[in-house]
C-alpha cells in the first residue's frame, strides 16, 4: 500500500481467483483514543472500533472511503483504491491501446518545435467517475523539472456503437535547451482513477522523436507565363523554432489529381518554393519535416490548381 | 572563432547534411523501435553529447563558435572510432552495400575539415563498449546509430546556421 495523495491510498493486488489479498491497517488521524468506530462509504454498518482498523483487501468491494467517527462526528477519511496485477502485469483497463506507433501505446505525445513544450493525449471509452493526474520530468535518476497542466477532455468521437473520449495535457520543460542534443528522455506519468480502480501509464521519449511541425503557411500559386507550370511558394509555420537558418525544415510538394488512383507527383526541396505542373482539377499540397532529423511529417497544406 | 579562424562553413554544411542522410539510411526508423527499453544507459551514456553549455545555440555560435566546434570535432572522432571498431566490423557482418562504410568515411571527411591534415587518432576507450555476443553487438549498433542521428542533426544545424550567418 502507498499514498497517492493526502488520505488516498493505493493497494496493489495480485489478481487471480482465490488470491489472499493484502492486509491493510488503517489509523484514524486523531488524538482521541477511545470510542472510535469505522464505516465504509455511505453504509452505517460499523466495521470495527478503536484507533486502528485491520482489513483484508481482496476485491473492489473492500475498497472505498473508510471513515472513523466518534459520537456522530467524523474524525478522518482514508480512500482505498485498487491497482490490479494479473500474471505479473499491471492492468490497463481504463485507457485504450492506440497501437501507434506500436502495440501497448496508451499515451501519445507530439511537439510542434524544440521549445520543450509538448502535448500528450490518450483515449478511453469511460465517460464518468474518471480522473487523471499527470507528472513529468527530464530523466528519472536526477529528474529535471517539467510542468504539466491539468488533463482536459479534448474530443469525443463515435466509434461504431460506443463513444470514445480523448483527453490531452500540455507540458513545458522548465529549463529547455532547444539547441542541445538530448541525452536524457522526458518521462511522462499519468495516474488514472476510475471509480475505485487505479492505473498508471508512462511514456518515455526525446522531444526530437515526437516533433511534428505544423503545416506550412501561406501556400500560394503563381502561374508561369506561356506554361502549364506554376510556382508554388509557402512559408515556415509560425510555431516552428527560430532562427530558421538553424532550425531548418525540408518540404515535400505533391500534385494530386481528383481521383485517388491518379499518380501523385512528388518533389522534395529545402527551399520555400518549387515549380510544378498543375493539372486540371488537381490540388497541390505541401508538408514539412525537420531537415536533419527524421521525425514526423506535418499534415498537408493544400490549394486547388484552378 | 577568434583570430579570423572559421571553418569552411559551406563545405561543413554539405558534409554534415550528407551525414544526416547516411545516418538515417544506415538505421531507418523501424516503427520507432524503442531502444531505450533495452536498458542502454550504460552503453550509450558514454558517447559525446552536444550539451546546453557547449555554445552550439545560435547566440553561442555568434559569440564564439570555438567551444561548439571543439565538441563537434571530438564527437566526430568518437563516432568514427566506434564505426571502425569491432562493434561494426565483427559478426554479424554488415552487408557489402551497407551505408555504414560511407557513414564512417563521411565522419572522417568532416572531422578532417576541423583538424590538421594527417591526424590518426588512437584511443584506449572504445573497447570498453565492445560486447561479446553477436546479438549484443547488433543491438549496440542500433543504439550507436540512433545516438549518432541525434548528434549529427545538431552538428548539421550548427554548420547550416554558420554557412548562412557566419561565413565571411
Amino acid at each position: 500500500i502507498w499514498e497517492l495523495k493526502k488520505d488516498v491510498y493505493v493497494v496493489e493486488l495480485d489478481w487471480y481467483p482465490d488470491a489472499p489479498g493484502e492486509m491493510v491497517v488503517l489509523t484514524c488521524d486523531t488524538p482521541e483514543e477511545d470510542g472510535i468506530t469505522w464505516t465504509l462509504d455511505q453504509s452505517s454498518e460499523v466495521l470495527g472500533s478503536g484507533k486502528t482498523l485491520t482489513i483484508q483487501v481482496k476485491e473492489f468491494g473492500d475498497a472505498g472511503q473508510y471513515t472513523c467517527h466518534k459520537g456522530g462526528e467524523v474524525l478522518s477519511h482514508s480512500l482505498l483504491l485498487l491497482h490490479k496485477k494479473e500474471d505479473g502485469i499491471w492492468s490497463t483497463d481504463i485507457l485504450k491501446d492506440q497501437k501507434e506507433p506500436k502495440n501497448k501505446t496508451f499515451l501519445r505525445c507530439e511537439a510542434k518545435n524544440y521549445s520543450g513544450r509538448f502535448t500528450c493525449w490518450w483515449l478511453t471509452t469511460i465517460s464518468t467517475d474518471l480522473t487523471f493526474s499527470v507528472k513529468s520530468s527530464r530523466g528519472s535518476s536526477d529528474p529535471q523539472g517539467v510542468t504539466c497542466g491539468a488533463a482536459t477532455l479534448s474530443a469525443e468521437r463515435v466509434r461504431g456503437d460506443n463513444k470514445e473520449y480523448e483527453y490531452s495535457v500540455e507540458c513545458q520543460e522548465d529549463s529547455a535547451c532547444p539547441a542541445a542534443e538530448e541525452s536524457l528522455p522526458i518521462e511522462v506519468m499519468v495516474d488514472a482513477v476510475h471509480k475505485l480502480k487505479y492505473e498508471n501509464y508512462t511514456s518515455s521519449f526525446f522531444i526530437r522523436d515526437i516533433i511534428k511541425p505544423d503545416p506550412p503557411k501561406n501556400l500560394q500559386l503563381k502561374p508561369l507565363k506561356n506554361s502549364r507550370q506554376v510556382e508554388v511558394s509557402w512559408e515556415y509555420p509560425d510555431t516552428w523554432s527560430t532562427p530558421h537558418s538553424y532550425f531548418s525544415l525540408t518540404f515535400c510538394v505533391q500534385v494530386q489529381g481528383k481521383s485517388k488512383r491518379e499518380k501523385k507527383d512528388r518533389v522534395f526541396t529545402d527551399k520555400t518554393s518549387a515549380t510544378v505542373i498543375c493539372r486540371k482539377n488537381a490540388s497541390i499540397s505541401v508538408r514539412a519535416q525537420d531537415r536533419y532529423y527524421s521525425s514526423s511529417w506535418s499534415e498537408w497544406a493544400s490549394v486547388p490548381c484552378s | 572563432v577568434p583570430g579570423g579562424s572559421s571553418p569552411a562553413w559551406t563545405q561543413c554544411q554539405q558534409l554534415s547534411q550528407k551525414l544526416c542522410t547516411l545516418a538515417w539510411s544506415a538505421h531507418p526508423l523501424v516503427g520507432h523501435m524503442d531502444l531505450r527499453e533495452e536498458g542502454d544507459e550504460e552503453t550509450t551514456n558514454d558517447v559525446p553529447h552536444i550539451q546546453c553549455g557547449d555554445g552550439c545555440d545560435p547566440q553561442g555560435l555568434r559569440d564564439n563558435s570555438q567551444f561548439c566546434l571543439q565538441r563537434i570535432h571530438q564527437g566526430l572522432i568518437f563516432y568514427e572510432k566506434l564505426l571502425g571498431s569491432d562493434i561494426f566490423t565483427g559478426e554479424p557482418s554488415l552487408l557489402p552495400d551497407s551505408p555504414v562504410g560511407q557513414l564512417h568515411a563521411s565522419l572522417l571527411g568532416l572531422s578532417q575539415l576541423l583538424q590538421p591534415e594527417g591526424h590518426h587518432w588512437e584511443t584506449q576507450q572504445i573497447p570498453s563498449l565492445s560486447p561479446s555476443q553477436p546479438w549484443q553487438r547488433l543491438l549496440l549498433r542500433f543504439k550507436i546509430l540512433r545516438s549518432l542521428q541525434a548528434f549529427v542533426a545538431v552538428a548539421a544545424r550548427v554548420f547550416a546556421h554558420g554557412a548562412a550567418t557566419l561565413s565571411p
Epitope: - | S6, Q112, P116
Partner: antibody, heavy 120, light 112 residues
Framework: EFQLQQSGPELVKPGASVKISCKAS????????MNWVKQSKGKSLEWIGV????????SYNQNFKGKATLTVDQSSSTAHMQLNSVTSEDSAVYYC?????????????WGTGTTVTVSS | DVVMTQTPLSLPVSLGDQASISCRSS???????????LHWYLQKPGQSPKLLIY???NRFSGVPDRFSGSGSGTDFTLKISRVEAEDLGVYFC?????????FGGGTKLEIN
C-alpha cells in the same frame, strides 16, 4: 593566469622508462588539447604528439610512436608523457604545450620544461 | 613530413634596426578549410618558447605591434620594425596545417 607546471629534472638509465607530468591551472583542462614538444641541446623543436583530454584520443608523430605514450588524469588536470626504453638520443628538454583550440592549432601556453638526462 | 627552412641562421642587428626572418615550407600550408597555419615563436635564453604570431599575420595577445608576419603558400616572413633588447633570442617558424607539426631550425637574433 594560464599555467603549465611540469615535474622536475630526471636522470634515467638507458633502457629504463620515465614518466613526466604537467599540471594545468587557470583554464578548463578538458577544453584544450595538450601537445608535447622535444628540444634537444642546441637543437630545434620536434612535435611529439597531442592528446584530447576528455576522451584520451591521441595522435603521434610517427618518429615517436612506441617511444612516447601520452595520458591524462582529468581529476587532477594533469597530463603525462611516458618515454619508454630510453637512449642517449632521448636526452632533451620536454615541454607540454596547450594548443589554442579548434581551427587555431597554435601552441599558446608552454610548460616550464622538464630536462631528461639519459646516462648510465 | 613538411620541412621548414629558416634563413638566416643568425641575424646580427643593431638596436632600433629593422629585422627580417624568412621561412619556407616544402609544401603549401593552405589547409583544405582555406586557412594557413604558419606561426612564429620566440625563445629567450633559459626560457620556454612563446607564441608571437599565429596564422601568418595575427599578433598574439600582448605582442607589440613592431612584430608583423606576412606571406602565403610556402613563403613567409617575420619582420621586427625596430629591434629592442628584449627581442633577442631564437625565432622559430612552425606549421600546423599538416601532422606532424614541424618547426624551422631557428634564427638567432643577436646584437651586432
Amino acid at each position: 593566469e594560464f599555467q603549465l607546471q611540469q615535474s622536475g629534472p630526471e636522470l634515467v638509465k638507458p633502457g629504463a622508462s620515465v614518466k613526466i607530468s604537467c599540471k594545468a591551472s587557470g583554464y578548463s583542462f578538458t577544453d584544450y588539447n595538450m601537445n608535447w614538444v622535444k628540444q634537444s641541446k642546441g637543437k630545434s623543436l620536434e612535435w611529439i604528439g597531442v592528446i584530447i583530454p576528455n576522451y584520451g584520443f591521441t595522435s603521434y608523430n610517427q618518429n615517436f610512436k612506441g617511444k612516447a605514450t601520452l595520458t591524462v588524469d582529468q581529476s587532477s588536470s594533469t597530463a603525462h608523457m611516458q618515454l619508454n626504453s630510453v637512449t642517449s638520443e632521448d636526452s632533451a628538454v620536454y615541454y607540454c604545450v596547450r594548443d589554442g583550440g579548434i581551427l587555431l592549432w597554435y601552441l599558446d601556453v608552454w610548460g616550464t620544461g622538464t630536462t631528461v638526462t639519459v646516462s648510465s | 613530413d613538411v620541412v621548414m627552412t629558416q634563413t638566416p641562421l643568425s641575424l646580427p642587428v643593431s638596436l632600433g634596426d629593422q629585422a627580417s626572418i624568412s621561412c619556407r615550407s616544402s609544401q603549401s600550408l593552405v589547409h583544405s578549410n582555406g586557412n594557413t597555419y604558419l606561426h612564429w615563436y620566440l625563445q629567450k635564453p633559459g626560457q620556454s618558447p612563446k607564441l608571437l604570431i599565429y596564422k601568418v599575420s595575427n599578433r598574439f595577445s600582448g605582442v607589440p605591434d613592431r612584430f608583423s608576419g606576412s606571406g602565403s603558400g610556402t613563403d613567409f616572413t617575420l619582420k621586427i620594425s625596430r629591434v629592442e633588447a628584449e627581442d633577442l633570442g631564437v625565432y622559430f617558424c612552425s606549421q600546423s596545417t599538416h601532422v606532424p607539426y614541424t618547426f624551422g631550425g631557428g634564427t638567432k637574433l643577436e646584437i651586432n
